[in-house]
């Protein structure tokens, strides 16, 4: 789904009812810290020498909707991404960085602590490189693990 | 193998109400998104809606939404379809499909249909 | 809601020969695109996901191709078991929408 053509129909009432307390997670791990904003998510990541992950999705995008589910259901991820800052937007950033080939949704991209977007951390898809599709799980498990290899940082 | 049974239709008033079944086996129930699909006589397909049963997470078609719930039962390994205020036009077969085996929206499986006639 | 827009409707082939169907999307789906096949007097029965991607059990007469707006299923060397309506389905958006059908005839 590529956010900047439409940005999903208004959320259904009906669907809006929340199944727990609504968290800074909006379903992606109730048990993961995640940060409000992506300055703090900076700010975090930068503090704390550990790598962000900048998960873009929408309510109202099926392919959100079905990522979010395996991811939180996934144990190894939710695993891993305790050792991340955690941010997950239902809007953009002004910063083009997050968005190198467009602003589809869902697309996840991994900023390194020296605040380098590592670019090179790509999905399987060539037409939408920050994709993930739920089949790619053990891609992201993989790219996580990438991420977590920091690039080399200044003394 | 996977098996989905839909249950419960039948004749009904305008007006009325109707609650169906779609009863599952063959996989694993709470992590497949459930859709629901009608089609008229001698029509085409409908999208109705779809239901994560993990959780009950829902998103329906904006053309049913305000008459139509879907629910889901993990005990039961079921998902049912509660329709409201039926009218003449719903008259259709409708059938439960799940989504993908690995949680993708897709839908990898239908069930055979049951008959919902809406006629006084 | 996204509309799909199938073609033709209806389709007298002889067995053996090459089916070609089309569907057109109203915008850009990428690549969520389903193929289905119905016989009377049953449910549809899912061929080909993802635009290109064949459901196993499948055979590999039927193939999918396309992205964007333009999609096409292709059965290559029909069967008579094969005489059916066949429907495109978009899943990159809700509602999930469906094409209107095309009723491939045995000659």
């Known amino acids: 789904k590529d956010t900047t053509v439409k940005s999903g129909a208004k959320k259904d009432p009906k669907d809006s009812r929340p199944k727990l307390p609504q968290t800074l997670s909006r379903g992606w791990g109730d048990q993961l810290i995640w940060t409000q904003t992506y300055e703090e998510a900076l700010y975090r990541s930068k503090t704390s020498n550990r790598p962000l992950m900048v998960i873009h999705h929408l309510d109202e995008c099926p392919h959100s909707q079905a990522l979010k589910k395996v991811f939180a259901e996934h144990k190894e991820i939710q695993k891993l991404a305790e050792q991340f800052v955690l941010l997950n937007l239902v809007y953009e950033t002004t910063d083009k960085h997050l968005s190198p080939d467009g602003q589809y949704v869902p697309r996840i991209v991994f900023v390194d602590p020296s605040l380098t977007v590592r670019a090179d951390i790509t999905g399987r898809y060539s037409n939408r490189l920050y994709a993930y599709e739920p089949s790619d799980t053990a891609l992201l498990y993989d790219n996580m693990k990438k991420a977590l290899k920091l690039l080399k940082t200044e003394l | 193998q996977v098996q989905l049974l839909e249950s419960g239709g039948g004749l009904v008033k305008p007006g009325g109400s109707l609650r169906l079944s779609c009863a599952t086996s063959?996989?694993?129930?709470?992590?497949?998104?459930m859709n629901w699909i009608r089609q008229a006589p001698g029509q085409g397909l409908e999208w109705i809606g779809w239901?994560?049963?993990?959780?009950?997470?829902?998103n329906y078609n904006g053309k049913v939404k305000d008459r139509f719930t879907l629910s889901a039962d993990k005990a039961k390994n079921s998902v049912y379809l509660q329709m409201n205020s039926l009218r003449a036009e719903d008259t259709a077969v409708y059938f439960c499909?799940?989504?993908?085996?690995?949680?993708?929206?897709?839908?990898?499986?239908w069930g055979q249909g049951t008959l919902v006639t809406v006629s006084s | 809601e996204i509309v799909l827009t199938q073609s033709p409707d209806f389709q007298s082939v002889t067995p053996k020969e090459k089916v070609t169907i089309t569907c057109k999307a109203s915008?850009?789906?990428?690549?969520?695109l389903s193929w289905f096949q119905q016989k009377p007097d049953q449910s549809p029965k899912t061929l080909i996901y993802?635009?290109?991607r064949l459901v196993d059990g499948v055979p590999s007469r039927f193939s999918g191709s396309g992205s964007g707006q333009d999609f096409t299923l292709t059965i290559n060397s029909l069967e008579a078991e094969d005489a059916a309506t066949y429907y495109c389905?978009?899943?990159?958006?809700?509602?999930?929408?469906f094409g209107g059908g095309t009723k491939v005839e045995i000659k």
């Open positions: 063959g996989y694993v129930f709470s992590r497949s998104w």
């Open positions: 239901i994560y049963p993990g959780d009950g997470d829902t």
């Open positions: 993802r635009a290109n």
């Open positions: 389905l978009q899943y990159d958006e809700f509602p999930f929408t």
């Open positions: 499909a799940r989504g993908g085996y690995d949680g993708s929206p897709w839908l990898s499986y």
């Open positions: 915008q850009d789906i990428n690549s969520y």
